[in-house]
Amino acid sequence: SGPRGVQALLCACTSCLQANYTCETDGACMVSIFNLDGMEHHVRTCIPKVELVPAGKPFYCLSSEDLRNTHCCYTDYCNRIDLRVPSGHLKEPEHPSMWGPVE
């Protein structure tokens, strides 16, 4: 289920300090967790609608087994959820840009 109507979707955003850790989007809210040097890191951000490709299974919403768990959702602040850290450790992916945080 996608975002409602034409109303902007409000999401938690870990990098949006000046906007009170909130971003606004026409797409989805995303939260991702990974394990780096034994530390859990959550990244929360907005994904614009144009970047939700391919339809049905957008790249930005896919988890990477043993590397990163990711959850996309479509209601205000739904990405405040905490995810379980994957069982593996973060290795350098072949295509880092695909999994990098979205600003």
């Epitope: 289920s1 409602r4 109303q7 979707l9 409000l10 988890s63 768990n69 959850h71 996309c72 959702c73 209601t75 205000d76 602040y77 739904c78 405040r80 959820i81 905490d82 995810l83 379980r84």
Partner: antibody, heavy 119, light 108 residues
Amino acid sequence: QVQLQESGPGLVKPSQTLSLTCTVSGGSISSGGYYWSWIRQHPGKGLEWIGYIYYSGSTYYNPSLKGRVTISVDTSKNQFSLKLSSVTAADTAVYYCAREEVGDWFDPWGQGTLVTVSS
Amino acid sequence: SSELTQDPAVSVALGQTVRITCQGDSLRKYYASWYQQKAGQAPVLVIYGKNKRPSGIPDRFSGSSSGNTASLTITGAQAEDEADYYCNSWDSSGNHVVFGGGTKLTVL
């Protein structure tokens, strides 16, 4: 401490619309940080999540009930409501309202209200 | 059928330790929360997130996760712990909230 209380008719005729209201006391729906949810429990069975609303009006529904469910909020009355259309006997259940922490745990719950669908 | 699977019934001797489990693919990614429901009453949250306990819940209740299984452990079960216990989380596609079928705990 936040408390929730369900209210509405205990008997609804088949094909009609079930309407329930949850009144929140001890806290404001508008304070943010929570979803306001409806959950039901068929007699002698497990729990089924129906859907939730954020004070902004942002809603999310169980896909299995989508199309029949509408959840709305009235921040001025500190209430949120459930409407379930085209009911059948299979919708007979105890209906609970609950506050949902974003992260999907429910606390607290209302005491529940039994709604029977019968002619 | 539920996407979260629980044993229908479990029993424990008074004062002993019991573990109630909840299985599902989604639990590799999402935390489960746990609810206690006594006969004729509304459910009460007992464990949420990464083994967090709401205020007022005794410390004999604890939670853990491994692989696709979440567990609720009661260490030193009391007579008042006799109840139905439900887990909940997201479904495997992350589309909606689901509950397990429930486990009836009997304290002998």
